[in-house]
Every structure is written in C-alpha cells, then in structure tokens.
C-alpha cells in the first residue's frame, strides 16, 4: 500500500499558485506524484509522474474554486488522492508593494507600486483585480514604538512638517475594505528629514 | 459584473462558413485572455481557440486552418470566424474570458478561464 502525500496545502501569493507536498515514509523506494485539477468534471493532469513535492498551478482561473488533488506512485501501485478546494481570489496571499520614498526638507513623498500578478508578463497588477484596493501606511520615528497609521487616497503621501533632522521609517501594504483583508507589509524605509523650511519673521 | 454575449450561431451546410460574436460588458477585452470553446451532445467542453491580450493566437488541432479567432477591442467585441464547416464542427459554442491574463501560461482548459458566456449553437448538416 503506498501512502499519500503528507501536508497537502496550496501556497499562493500574487496568484502565483504553487501546490506544495511532502513525501510520505516509503520503503520500497523513491515515490513520484501526480498532481491534477478538476475542469468542467473531468480531472486534468498538471504534474505527472514528478520527483519534485510541488506542482504550478499557476494558469487557473482567478475566479471560482478550483478542487486540486495529488497522489503518490511507485510502480504500478498508487495512494488514495488527497482533495483540496482553492479559490485565488480569496486565499492567494497579497505580497508587499514596492515603494519609492524621497526627503523634501521636513516632508517625505512616498509613491506606492502595487504588487504585479506573479504569473503573468504584462503590467497587471494585484490593484487591477480588486476594485476595492486601498494602501495602508504605517511609519514611526527610528527607535521609538509609537506608530501612526494612515490610508492614502491615492498611489502617493507625503508626510509633512515631520522633526527637523530625524529619521523615519515607513511601510506600506495593500488592503481591501469589501473584504477586510490585509496584504504583507513592506520592508521599512527609513529615511532622515532635513530642515524645517519655514521662514523665520 | 463581467457579462459576455456570444451570437451568430445557426444551421448551415457543411463546407460553409458562419462567424461568430461575443459582446462584453463589465470588461475590456484589452486586459486579458479570451476563448472559444464548444460542447457536443454527450461530449465535455473542449478548448476551440485563444487569444491572448498580446494578439497571439492558439488553435485546437481540429480546427486550425479553416477558424480564426480575432478580437476588435474598440468595439470589445470577440470573433470566431469559422469556414469549411464540417458535421463534427456541431455543437454549443461559448466565449470565455479570463481577465488581467497576458498569456503568459498557455490557457486551453475550462478551469483557466473565469467568466463565461451563455453559449450560441452551431449546427452544420452533411
């Protein structure tokens, strides 16, 4: 009897869809995999006979739930398949933006760049498939707790009449309001201020 | 809400020719993938042709040299023309869209295309 695959679980960011595996305790030898996906009733192959324990799903549909299966093979002998249910655009996992941060005297301009679909070659973006797609922003002074939290109405801040030749440290992440959910956050930038640019009377 | 309306199907004699259309709304036909697919009685839906948000094109083996598959994204409208029709060219045909999809896996199966109009018949006699 040769037994499934262990800790099936999809891991999809940017709608990048990697099905990942492990491979059970076998010790008759080395176990290869099949990996399908249910289209229109029917079971399609996506990766046969593989030595590797993840499959690209990365072609399906954005929209809908997709059923995605695996099983273990040695010879002609094979496990029971083991069945999980997937929906991309509810679980795939929203990576961090891209952010460009320029000092202005007391201000820092921020412009954001959302996340690209990972599986594709054009310009599309996560912020294309949400319609609802905001920014939140979080930054704080360099070696304090306190953080402040704003949603920008548009790709681009600017924080203003910050300290005088302090550091701050900002990050971004997308979010969804309809659905209250959450991106990963970007790594901080953290950039020192200038001076204050009003004139004294 | 993507809406797509496909139209010109009909009853015609093998060797013709007929074309046909999808309208979309809620979409623009510039931002993703597109596809033909058909369902014969008892058959299951079978990829026909694509068309990727680039302009490049796929065919079914079945079909290629006699459908071509082409989209006018001022008038985000979607074609099939098919010529040479033959008595296994039978069946409901649907338009298919996946939007924000450039292509860059090939899509030839139902479970890679979202959205889905309600079908047109296509039946050519002998």
């Known amino acids: 009897m040769v037994p499934p695959p262990e800790n099936v679980r999809m891991n999809s960011v940017n709608f990048k869809n990697i099905l990942q595996w492990e491979s059970p305790a076998f010790a008759k030898g080395n176990l290869t995999f099949t990996a399908q996906y249910l289209s229109y009733r029917i079971f399609q192959d996506k990766c046969m006979n593989t030595t590797l324990t993840e499959c690209d799903f990365s072609s399906l549909s954005k929209y809908g739930d997709h059923t995605l299966r695996v099983r273990a093979e040695f010879a002609d002998e094979h496990s029971d398949w083991v069945n999980i249910t997937f929906c991309p655009v509810d679980d795939t996992i929203i990576g961090p933006p891209g952010m460009q941060v320029e000092v202005l005297a007391d201000s820092l301009h921020m412009r954001f760049l959302a996340p690209k679909i990972e599986n594709e070659y054009e310009t599309w973006t996560m912020k294309n498939v949400y319609n609802s797609w905001t920014y939140n922003v979080q930054y704080w002074k360099n070696g304090t707790d306190e953080k402040f939290q704003i949603t920008p109405q548009y790709d681009f801040e600017v924080l203003r009449n910050l300290e005088p030749w302090t550091t701050y440290c900002v990050q971004v992440r997308g979010f969804l309001p309809d659905r209250n959910k959450a991106g990963e956050w970007s790594e901080p930038v953290c950039e020192q201020t200038t001076h204050d640019e009003t004139v004294p009377s | 809400q993507v809406q797509l309306q496909e139209s010109g199907g009909g009853s015609v004699q093998a060797g013709g020719s007929l074309r046909l259309s999808c309208a979309a709304s809620g979409y623009t036909y510039s931002s993703g993938c597109m596809g033909w697919f058909r369902q014969a009685p008892g058959k299951e839906r079978e990829g026909v042709a694509t068309?990727?948000?680039?302009?490049?094109?796929n065919y079914a083996d079945s079909v290629k040299g006699r459908f071509t598959i082409s989209k006018d994204n001022a008038k985000n409208t979607l074609y099939l023309q098919m010529n040479s029709l033959k008595p296994e060219d039978t069946g409901m045909y649907y338009c298919a869209a996946e939007p924000y999809c450039s292509g860059g896996y090939p899509r030839w199966s139902v479970a890679e295309f979202g959205y889905w109009g309600q079908g047109t018949q296509v039946t050519v006699s002998s």
């Open positions: 068309i990727n948000s680039d302009g490049s094109t």
